[in-house]
């Protein structure tokens, strides 16, 4: 696993412990909470990052209408179970033996049950809609410039292949970024859209996961873009399974920087 050799840190994940105990005295970094060795040349999986976070000390419509099966992460933080590759296990349980099934981004996609609950497979989240509202700016943003800058950001900062950024929509002050990545499209070594979205989410909350970098400075032709609130919608390859009670129980609030994992539908 590559890491900065000079001072042995992980550029892409500050929630690691690094030491020169790899082969030939090379720097090796392990995620906090799980102790799993991470590849510091790319993004760390969201599952390992959530586990590390839980182990740390506490501190004319052009816009897309999220589809009825879109999940919003209303449950918030939990200490997840990750598989040896760092992916979320399909079934997650808490300390009180309450269990539920999650998708590939770790968002609950079934009602909660007990230890008898079965989650046959990890369902892939293939479409992520990041919905942002930006702060009023002195200068207006040009849509094509904004599109280019956000695509550059996902390519350069999050190492996400450009083909996975499906669209950028802009209807001031709302920006929507659509990420799409089917199982068949994702090649070995490709950054997962769920991981890229999580890094972006943390960046726009001022909680960068990158080592030693200041906060994300995002400019469009020199004009800074500041984010007032973020909502992230997750769509799975197989629609989620919730009881009718939940589906008719009203929508979810969307305060500043909450990403509410909902299920809405096209």
């Amino acid at each position: 696993h590559t890491a900065a050799q000079d001072n042995c840190t992980c550029p892409t994940n500050k929630m690691t412990v690094c030491s020169p105990d790899g082969p030939g005295g090379r720097c090796q970094c392990r995620a906090l909470g799980s102790g799993v060795a991470v590849d510091c040349s790319t993004l760390t999986s969201k599952c390992l990052l959530l586990k590390a976070r839980m182990s740390a000390p506490k501190n004319a419509r052009t816009l897309v209408r999220p589809n009825e099966h879109a999940l919003v992460d209303n449950d918030g933080l939990y200490d997840p179970d990750c598989d040896p590759e760092g992916r979320f296990k399909a079934r997650q349980c808490n300390q009180t033996s309450v269990c539920w099934c999650v998708n590939s981004v770790g968002v609950r996609r079934t009602d909660k049950g007990d230890l008898s609950l079965r989650c046959d497979e990890l369902v892939r989240t293939h479409h992520i809609l990041i919905d942002l509202r930006h702060r009023p700016t002195a200068g207006a943003f040009n849509h094509s410039d904004l599109d280019a800058e956000l695509r550059r950001l996902f390519r350069e900062r999050y190492r996400l292949h450009p083909k996975f950024v499906a669209a950028v929509h802009y209807e001031q002050p709302t920006i929507q970024i659509e990420l799409r990545q089917n199982t068949s499209q994702k090649a070995a070594g490709d950054v997962d859209i769920g991981d890229a979205a999580y890094y972006f989410e943390r960046d726009v909350k001022g909680e960068s996961l990158f080592q030693g970098r200041g906060g994300l400075d995002l400019r469009v032709r020199g004009e800074p873009l500041q984010v007032e609130r973020t909502l992230i919608y997750y769509l799975d390859e197989i629609p989620p399974k919730f009881s009718m009670k939940r589906l008719t129980g009203g929508g979810s609030g969307g305060g500043s920087h909450h990403h509410h994992h909902h299920h809405h539908h096209h």
């Epitope: 009023p136 960046d203 909350k205 001022g206 906060g215 400075d217 032709r221 020199g222 873009l225 984010v227």
Partner: antibody, heavy 122, light 106 residues
Framework: QVQLVQSGAEVKKPGASVKVSCKAS????????INWVRQRPGQGLEWMGW????????KYAQKFQGRVTMTVDTSTSTVYMELSSLRSEDTAVYYC???????????????WGQGTLVTVSS | EIVLTQSPATLSLSPGERATLSCSAS?????IYWYQRKPGQAPRLLIY???NLASGIPARFSGSGSGTDFTLTISSLEPEDFAVYYC?????????FGQGTKVEIK
């Protein structure tokens, strides 16, 4: 630490041009914009415009449009502000100031250069 | 152009007293920035985004307000606080500053 050092005082004749430099150090030069603000004797602060070194984007105050030119030399981390067709009322202290920003906050103008006195007199 | 009007123009106070400086905008702004300027020195940022203390600024300085009315408060004046204070908006171009409030020793 972050520092902006400006060129020395200038005396110019009406109709001439002046070019003031602002050399940045202590941070990644291309990561924030450099603004120019002037203060005329006995007056308040007046914003002239900014330039963003990463891509050369700039924004000028309408009042100075056509008379002001901001340029950047990334090899020396220096920004230049040229004001042409000088008149006596352009006599002022000219400041450069950097503005850091993130997706969370706009951190205002901080720090400022020490200022350059430009005197326009016949 | 957004006009920022500061009041009072001059504030005469003694060390240890509380100073309250006002900045009124001609139209609604989202955030205000406050600067301190001493004779012969460049301005220094005190407050960004209305209420956040800039790096290295003592906690006796605080900012508040919204819409068109904003306030800079110095809870207990120190001798080095006697200076001119300016508010600034970043809501629309051109960026504008208030005309300044001079805080002088009584």
């Amino acid at each position: 630490q972050v520092q902006l050092v400006q060129s020395g005082a200038e005396v110019k004749k009406p109709g001439a041009s002046v070019k003031v430099s602002c050399k940045a150090s202590g941070y990644t030069f291309t990561s924030s914009d450099i603004n120019w603000v002037r203060q005329r004797p006995g007056q308040g602060l007046e914003w002239m415009g900014w330039i963003y070194p990463r891509d050369g984007s700039k924004k000028y105050a309408q009042k100075f449009q056509g008379r002001v030119t901001m340029t950047v030399d990334t090899s020396t981390s220096t920004v230049y502000m040229e004001l042409s067709s000088l008149r006596s009322e352009d006599t002022a202290v000219y400041y450069c100031a950097t503005r850091f920003a993130t997706v969370v906050s706009n951190y205002g103008l901080d720090p400022w250069g020490q200022g350059t006195l430009v005197t326009v007199s016949s | 152009e957004i006009v920022l009007t500061q009041s009072p123009a001059t504030l005469s106070l003694s060390p240890g007293e509380r100073a309250t400086l006002s900045c009124s905008a001609s139209s609604s702004v989202n955030y205000i920035y406050w600067y301190q300027r001493k004779p012969g020195q460049a301005p220094r940022l005190l407050i960004y985004d209305t209420s956040n203390l800039a790096s290295g600024i003592p906690a006796r300085f605080s900012g508040s307000g919204s819409g068109t009315d904003f306030t800079l408060t110095i809870s207990s004046l120190e001798p080095e606080d006697f200076a001119v204070y300016y508010c600034q908006q970043w809501n629309s171009y051109p960026l504008t500053f208030g005309q300044g409030t001079k805080v002088e020793i009584k």
